[in-house]
Amino acid sequence: EQKLISEEDLAAKKVVLGKKGDTVELTCNASQKKNTQFHWKNSNQIKILGIQGLFLTKGPSKLSDRADSRKSLWDQGCFSMIIKNLKIEDSDTYICEVENKKEEVELLVFGLTANSDTHLLEGQSLTLTLESPPGSSPSVKCRSPGGKNIQGGRTISVPQLERQDSGTWTCTVSQDQKTVEFKIDIVVLAFQKASSTVYKKEGEQVEFSFPLAFTLEKLTGSGELWWQAERASSSKSWITFDLKNKEVSVKRVTQDPKLQMGKKLPLHLTLPQALPQYAGSGNLTLALEAKTGKLHQEVNLVVMRATQFQENLTCEVWGPTSPKLTLSLKLENKGATVSKQAKAVWVLNPEAGMWQCLLSDSGQVLLESNIKVVPTWPTPVQP
């Protein structure tokens, strides 16, 4: 005969937090470690599952195809209910009836998703939205891979993504002193560096590299390098290219300079010679297929030239240099030095020997060029 369960037989309600799509195990333990009758019901008293003889039986609930129990643990008095592929609407109070006791478990299922694609361009905004059961009042705290903490309620917004935001975001949802952790992988589509400067002596080969800060299985898009030479009044397109399945193919290249581009990633360009007329700054843009906006990397070229003309030894640099850079001319193994925070230095009637032209930043040499000054003999006076 069915015994009535009194109020004192009703154990304190437990709260369990679950994640949408995950599996949860709601525990229910009998005092005696033996197989006995048990039932799991929802708040509407609809049977979900239970035991009939030695067999697991399922009721007419919506959970019937996703609910199960660990039969191997029944002999130990453990009558847990496992719910697979959790849905927000699975949030409910579940009752386990065993040994004339009722154990209530409140299950709250949460979901946290990115509103858009998780592959976002640098500077774009990321919004994370929390799905939660009616009546709940959760709080959310997210930590970026770089250690940035952001708090919110039903939505969390990161207005401008930076390249260091790439990686796994860990978000903790709290409700009734319980927590559930979500991990969301965010890929910030950007170049590894926002800007880079190449320092070269006149005539040297120049290499520009544009490594990406992410990897994708299939990478398709198109790009262009615009160049603003210091000596030119306007910028010009140096090269345009396509990127298909990580293979680079050049579409159009300027005739001067004659650039070469690598066909593999990372994007790589070679300029045969560093010349003063090429010194300046460029902007490489990459538009990725199915993404709005473009990736950008700035690249600067600084060119040095040391020349001797008649009695004048000159060292010059062209290109974007900061005012704090020092340009100096010094005679090897001698104290003679001329230094200036300028783009040109010169020595009149230089001593014979090996002169060094140095471009330095706080003592660190960025670029050097050597020039040999040969002794000049006075021209004999014609009789």
């Epitope: 080969q205 290499e207 298909k244 293979e247 070469q260 690598g262 593999k264 070679t270 045969p272």
Partner: antibody, heavy 118, light 107 residues
């Protein structure tokens, strides 16, 4: 085992045409770039042409541009080289090659000989 | 087009010798360089890609190094089956170009 088997070589008169085939097996043909490389008698290796994977970009050596056409039939796992306006200097052993994921020619066929002579 | 210059064009060596072949590119090609081996009457066999990565199945006595314009193929201890012609190949961009080859002969 990855295998490439060339066919279609032979003797042809200057100005004539030939179509070389390369049957591929042992790998997912459509996902790799494929190339043709040739070697004239007693000479070194010369790259002729490359066709990228299923996107189909094609590249040619200046010496064959406008005369040779590379193509592929992914459903038949076959690479082709259509050679028109053949010249004596096109006489060579033609090798079919497969590129690896890093776009290097990692597997080579045994080659097929093309002789252009009157 | 990028020119690839191999040296020497031929060399004589004995079994057990350490052999070094160099390849120079006319411009910087990063590490986009491969090496292959060809025996008389046979198809070339790929040995090394990305300047230093050994193709699977290639004996560890073969090694490659270099970046930019200067590259080296080294055979640490020459074996009888290593007597062949070796070619370097730039894979930086099109047109792909080979070195003229280095013939390794028995001394």
């Amino acid at each position: 085992e990855v295998q490439l088997l060339e066919s279609g070589g032979g003797l042809v008169q200057p100005g004539g045409s030939l179509r070389l085939s390369c049957a591929a097996s042992g790998f997912t043909f459509s996902t790799y770039a494929m190339s043709w490389v040739r070697q004239a008698p007693g000479k070194g290796l010369e790259w002729v042409s490359t066709i990228s994977d299923n996107i189909g970009n094609t590249y040619y050596a200046d010496s064959v541009k406008g005369r040779f056409t590379i193509s592929r039939d992914n459903s038949k796992n076959t690479l082709y080289l259509q050679m028109n306006s053949l010249r004596a200097e096109d006489t060579a052993v033609y090798y079919c090659t497969k590129d690896n994921e890093d776009y290097y020619m990692d597997v080579w066929g045994k080659g097929t000989t093309v002789t252009v002579s009157s | 087009a990028i020119q690839m210059t191999q040296s020497p064009s031929s060399l004589s060596a004995s079994v057990g010798d350490r052999v070094t072949i160099t390849c120079r590119a006319s411009q910087g090609i990063r590490n986009d360089l491969g090496w292959c081996q060809q025996k008389p009457g046979k198809a070339p066999k790929f040995l090394i890609y990305a300047a230093s990565t050994l193709q699977s199945g290639v004996p560890s006595r073969f090694s490659g190094s270099g970046y930019g314009t200067d590259f080296t193929l080294t055979i640490s201890s020459l074996q009888p089956e290593d007597f062949a012609t070796y070619y370097c190949l730039q894979d930086y961009n099109y047109p792909r170009t080979f070195g003229q080859g280095t013939k390794v002969e028995i001394k």
